[in-house]
């Protein structure tokens, strides 16, 4: 395979590098379904975009296999710590793959933000950020889950979001 | 456009890829102006650097249009929660663009760190990290703001910082 | 140096770009040594991998000089705030270089998570994330330290981790 063949290959690689897969999805009122499913995201308007990745029912879907830095931030907030709400909030990025029926944990955080409020009527805010490099195959999906999602606060797509890019 | 022309283009792209835009700016005593403006940053000393991006009055200035992972961390701290300080701290990355003179929110976090202190004389520390991919045009600027900036604690450029790189 | 020589160089660069240095190391029961040294990490099993970087005694070792986005997250947790534990937890990424005997701080966070617990018997959780771009020379090492590491909670490599990739 001499320079001629390699040339085509290189040109192809250059073109594919131009669209290095990347995405940034943003939170909206419709993000929180209350159904026990993952968070849903805005994919087109505002700051949201998909480039070389696709989206389906809350999931970033990988088109091109490789190592990806995946990240998510969620804005948490409440008034005091109402009974019935877990004192621990779990925010995680999970992988869905055709080979396994159950989601696989990728990156997870646990926080106890309610404890910050010194009185039951005090407003509190907290934020959880996750980011890390994982290997993803074509067709695999990544979703964000928050338990208890009732404490996620959405506004304008800048406070809760989900994204990825190939490294 | 045969291999000869493409060759030059590829060499050019290779050279430009060698300087994939990136920057990391660090906090310094002069970062907090108290003027209501954005935080200011060290751009050259210590861990700070600019590569394919420039800096002006607190802002990272984009030279080459594209998608950038932008990030910032601020170290927060105080003694109790003094009256007159907001119980909510907002830490955000904002974009300035000539067509839209008012800053546009990109990534934002709200936190209530004071509530952690169980007594009014207790020292507390907290940290806020933001990161995400956004599209930036040549000439656009990104700044960091913290409200209330009086709670930002600066020391040696490792605890509060601001950076970006093209993805 | 005409197209022929440049061709080899370009092919070489393409090959090296295919293995853009990246790593993600995960927490394990053996991460916490109690010896005052840095945290140790899983490098092969589960989500952990090394690509174009190596590992030695808790450190990511750089093979190829350049700018790297380095990151770490640690999961913190406890029951109340036991006496003898510092009220401040420091989580940092540090560089070891042959030229300097002492570690150099790169990115650091301080947090006071215990203060969240409103009673001495209450379980609390918190998470600390750090990420930023730094320049690393071949042979330099990056480690993670947490003081007090007794508050780091490890489980299945998804809650505490350490990684890097060249930008």
């Amino acid at each position: 395979d001499g320079p001629a063949g390699s040339w085509e290959q290189l040109i192809q690689e250059r073109r594919s590098h131009e669209v290095n897969p990347a995405a940034h999805l943003t939170g909206a009122n419709s993000s929180l379904t209350g159904s026990g499913g993952p968070l849903l995201w805005e994919t087109q308007l505002g700051l949201a975009f998909l480039r070389g990745l696709s989206y389906h029912d809350g999931a970033l879907v990988v088109t091109k296999a490789g190592y990806y830095y995946i990240y998510s931030k969620v804005q948490l907030g409440g008034v005091g710590c109402p009974l019935g709400l877990a004192s621990t909030i779990t925010h995680g990025l999970y992988k869905r793959t055709p080979r396994y029926p159950e989601e696989l944990e990728l990156l997870v955080s646990q926080q106890s933000p309610c404890g910050r409020a010194t009185s039951s009527s005090r407003v509190w805010w907290d934020s959880s950020f996750l980011g890390g490099v994982v290997h993803l195959e074509a067709g695999e999906k990544v979703v964000v889950r928050v338990l208890d999602e009732r404490l996620v606060r959405l506004r304008d797509g800048t406070r809760s979001y989900f994204g990825a890019f190939m490294v | 456009d045969g291999p000869a022309g493409s060759w030059e283009q590829l060499i050019q792209e290779r050279r430009s890829h060698e300087v994939n835009p990136a920057a990391h700016l660090t906090g310094a005593n002069s970062s907090l102006t108290g003027s209501g403006g954005p935080l200011l940053w060290e751009t050259q000393l210590g861990l700070a650097f600019l590569r394919g991006l420039s800096y002006h009055d607190g802002a990272l200035v984009v030279t080459k249009a594209g998608y950038y992972y932008i990030y910032s961390k601020v170290q927060l701290g105080g003694v109790g929660c003094p009256l007159g300080l907001a119980s909510t701290i907002t830490h955000g990355l904002y974009k300035r663009t000539p067509r839209y003179p008012e800053e546009l929110e990109l990534l934002v976090s709200q936190q209530s760190p004071c509530g952690r202190a169980t007594s009014s004389s207790r020292v507390w520390w907290d940290s806020s990290f933001l990161g995400g991919v956004v599209h930036l045009e040549a000439g656009e600027k990104v700044v960091v703001r913290v409200l209330d900036e009086r709670l930002v604690r600066l020391r040696d450029g490792t605890r509060s910082y601001f950076g970006a790189f093209m993805v | 140096d005409g197209p022929a020589g440049s061709w080899e160089q370009l092919i070489q660069e393409r090959r090296s770009h295919e293995v853009n240095p990246a790593a993600h190391l995960t927490g394990a029961n053996s991460s916490l040594t109690g010896s005052g040294g840095p945290l140790l990490w899983e490098t092969q099993l589960g989500l952990a991998f090394l690509r174009g970087l190596s590992y030695h005694d808790g450190a990511l070792v750089v093979t190829k000089a350049g700018y790297y986005y380095i990151y770490s997250k640690v999961q913190l947790g406890g029951v109340g705030c036991p006496l003898g534990l510092a009220s401040t937890i420091t989580h940092g990424l540090y560089k070891r270089t042959p030229r300097y005997p002492e570690e150099l701080e790169l990115l650091v966070s301080q947090q006071s998570p215990c203060g969240r617990a409103t009673s001495s018997s209450r379980v609390w959780w918190d998470s600390s994330f750090l990420g930023g771009v730094v320049h690393l020379e071949a042979g330099e090492k990056v480690v993670v330290r947490v003081l007090d590491e007794r508050l780091v909670r490890l489980r299945d490599g998804t809650r505490s981790y350490f990684g890097a990739f060249m930008v």
Partner: antibody, heavy 117, light 110 residues
Framework: QVQLVQSGAEVKKPGASVKVSCKAS????????ISWVRQAPGQGLEWMGW????????NYAQKLQGRVTMTTDTSTSTAYMELRSLRSDDTAMYYC??????????WGQGTLVTVSS | QSALTQPASVSGSPGQSITISCTGT?????????VSWYQQHPGKAPKLMIY???KRPSGVSNRFSGSKSGNTASLTISGLQAEDEADYYC??????????FGGGTKLTVL
């Protein structure tokens, strides 16, 4: 400066198709969406849909699904809107506009499409 | 999703202030700070006047201001001038990749 220039007026018969172009300049075409909005004589603005120039994803208004197709040619920074099976009530001024975050700015000068037998 | 509700017409004398309302729901106007306003003179293309509820693009007079309360957004024009006579449209993000226009308001300068 950022500018959108549309193709000229069209007169079409019922049942025919029309394809309107919108050439962009002054910004990175592939980084923003192009939206299409129409306005029947004496009526308000009606959003027709948009296309993301960087990945060709489209989003069409429910009432036009199946009749409208939006495309882009990134090599010429041009967006196209094709409307098929034209009816008399499709007579309108058709505007393209850059979709910047959650608003439309700037707008093209408009293309008048008249559907008449 | 139906269009946002605007008054069909408003009028005012030169120098006066007028306000045009735009009423939606908690799923659109009330749910986000993403309301924009457009001015359209007869035979011309619409022009962005306000974005993100209250922000003005460069080149737009500071006589134009925007605000929001609950599910209603408002455009206020102070010091009314003859050239302000035009149609005004509001638009709001409504989640799920949806934008909604108002029905439009005809402003007459008496």
């Amino acid at each position: 400066q950022v500018q959108l220039v549309q193709s000229g007026a069209e007169v079409k018969k019922p049942g025919a198709s029309v394809k309107v172009s919108c050439k962009a300049s002054g910004y990175t075409f592939t980084s923003y969406g192009i939206s299409w909005v129409r306005q029947a004589p004496g009526q308000g603005l009606e959003w027709m849909g948009w296309i993301s120039a960087h990945n060709a994803n489209t989003n069409y208004a429910q009432k036009l699904q199946g009749r409208v197709t939006m495309t882009t040619d990134t090599s010429t920074s041009t967006a196209y809107m094709e409307l098929r099976s034209l009816r008399s009530d499709d007579t309108a001024m058709y505007y393209c506009a850059r979709l910047y975050r959650n608003w439309f700015d700037p707008w093209g000068q408009g293309t008048l499409v008249t559907v008449s037998s | 999703q139906s269009a946002l509700t605007q008054p069909a017409s408003v009028s005012g004398s030169p120098g006066q202030s007028i306000t045009i309302s735009c009423t939606g729901t908690s799923s659109d106007v009330g749910g986000y700070n993403y309301v924009s306003w457009y001015q359209q003179h007869p035979g011309k293309a619409p022009k962005l006047m306000i974005y993100d509820v209250s922000k003005r693009p460069s080149g737009v007079s500071n006589r134009f201001s925007g605000s929001k309360s609950g599910n209603t957004a408002s455009l206020t024009i102070s010091g009314l001038q003859a050239e302000d006579e035009a149609d005004y449209y509001c638009c709001s993000y409504a989640g799920s990749s949806t934008l909604l226009f108002g029905g439009g308001t005809k402003l007459t300068v008496l």
